[in-house]
């Protein structure tokens, strides 16, 4: 079985997959469509990469621009290097800005929602 | 058949509010986005906002921002658009549209509700 | 925000002859993210092109789409009677989302 027809058996099951499952995913050519992506939990995606959204989405990676602005995605935007994003070539912007240290502060993160950030 | 099927003509006074149903068939409402958008007599087409129904999230253009309001009762598989404190601009016909999450473009298109905003 | 300024505002055309629409942004709009769309009046608009060159389903061949940039074009190789309407472009390249003031066809 390949990729593309494993994640159509568990696909309706995903919702509530951990970040460890969405890693091992990631590995597996699932081309996830971003309505499931979507449909993640946010603290089980935000935890993710760029290279794994990436793998994770496939070609479906472009539709992350349209959906910039829309939980989970732009939580995720959020955490990420703005470096990183550049990789992707959509235009995604509000990154963590170069020069930048992320602390991981999960009080202050609970309480604002945002990570803590550290300016050179 | 994909259908977004939308209610009839209202008239309403200025100040007032108004909450246009848009009733999606022939696919699940929660698989898609569903955005709106106004269109005034003669002109063109202006983006409202839009919605994904499995968790609600809305954003919206900054023009109508704290006016509007965008939400869907998944259960009836109904998406509503409120909009508040309406004036003589905001006679229009609207349309809500659907949008394959992950693209921008709108592939299903509503009939329409016309809204005449008038004393 | 990003303007899209669709040119001409309204245009005749012959049976047979081939129509050109242009749509021209303020600012660099990837392809992907640039869209065209039909309106009839009284009726809802369709989609008729999508990432500036892909037919919607159930639109004639006749018709195509090019550009890149900041110029984008809709053109039909042989006017219709069916092709009158009104065609919008339309963005979503940056937020918020916009669309052209439209191009209204008519069949001389």
């Known amino acids: 079985m390949n990729g593309s027809e494993y994640f159509v058996k568990i696909q309706s099951f995903l919702g509530g997959a951990p970040t460890e499952d969405l890693k091992a995913l990631s590995q597996q050519n699932v081309s996830m469509d971003l309505a499931t992506f979507m449909k993640l939990r946010t603290d089980a995606v935000l935890p993710l990469t760029v290279a794994e959204v990436q793998k994770l989405l496939g070609p479906h990676v472009e539709g992350l621009k349209a959906e910039e602005r829309h939980r989970p995605v732009r939580d995720w935007i959020l955490r990420q290097r703005q470096d990183d994003l550049d990789t992707l070539g959509l235009g995604l912007q509000g990154g963590i800005p170069n020069g930048y240290l992320v602390l991981d502060l999960s009080m202050q993160e609970a309480l604002s929602g945002t990570p803590c950030l550290l300016g050179p | 058949e994909v259908q977004l099927q939308q209610s009839g003509p209202e008239l309403v006074k200025p100040g007032a509010s108004v909450k246009i149903p848009c009733k999606a068939s022939g696919y699940t409402i929660t698989d898609y986005n569903m955005d709106w958008v106004k269109q005034s007599r003669g002109k063109s087409l202006e983006w409202i906002g839009d919605?994904?129904?499995?968790?609600?999230?809305?954003i919206y253009n900054q023009k109508f921002e704290g006016r509007a309001t965008l939400t869907v009762d998944k259960y009836s598989s109904t998406a509503y658009m409120e909009l508040r404190g309406l004036t003589s601009e905001d006679t229009a016909v609207y349309f809500c549209?659907?949008?394959?999450?992950?693209?921008?473009?709108?592939?299903?298109w509503g009939t329409g509700t016309t809204v005449t905003v008038s004393s | 925000q990003l303007v899209l300024t669709q040119s001409p505002a309204i245009m005749s055309a012959s049976p047979g002859e081939k129509v050109t629409l242009t749509c021209s942004a303020s600012s660099s709009v990837s392809s992907t993210y640039l869209s065209w769309y039909l309106q009839k009046p009284g009726s809802s608009p369709k989609l008729w092109i999508y990432s500036t060159s892909n037919l919607a389903s159930g639109v004639p061949a006749r018709f195509s789409g090019s550009g890149s940039g900041t110029s984008y074009s809709l053109t039909i190789s042989s006017m219709e009677a069916e092709d009158a309407a009104s065609y919008f472009c339309?963005?979503?390249?940056?937020?918020?989302?916009?669309f052209g003031g439209g191009t209204k066809l008519e069949i001389k």
């Open positions: 339309h963005q979503w390249s940056s937020y918020p989302y916009t």
């Open positions: 549209a659907r949008r394959k999450t992950g693209t921008g473009y709108f592939d299903v």
């Open positions: 919605v994904f129904p499995y968790n609600g999230d809305s």
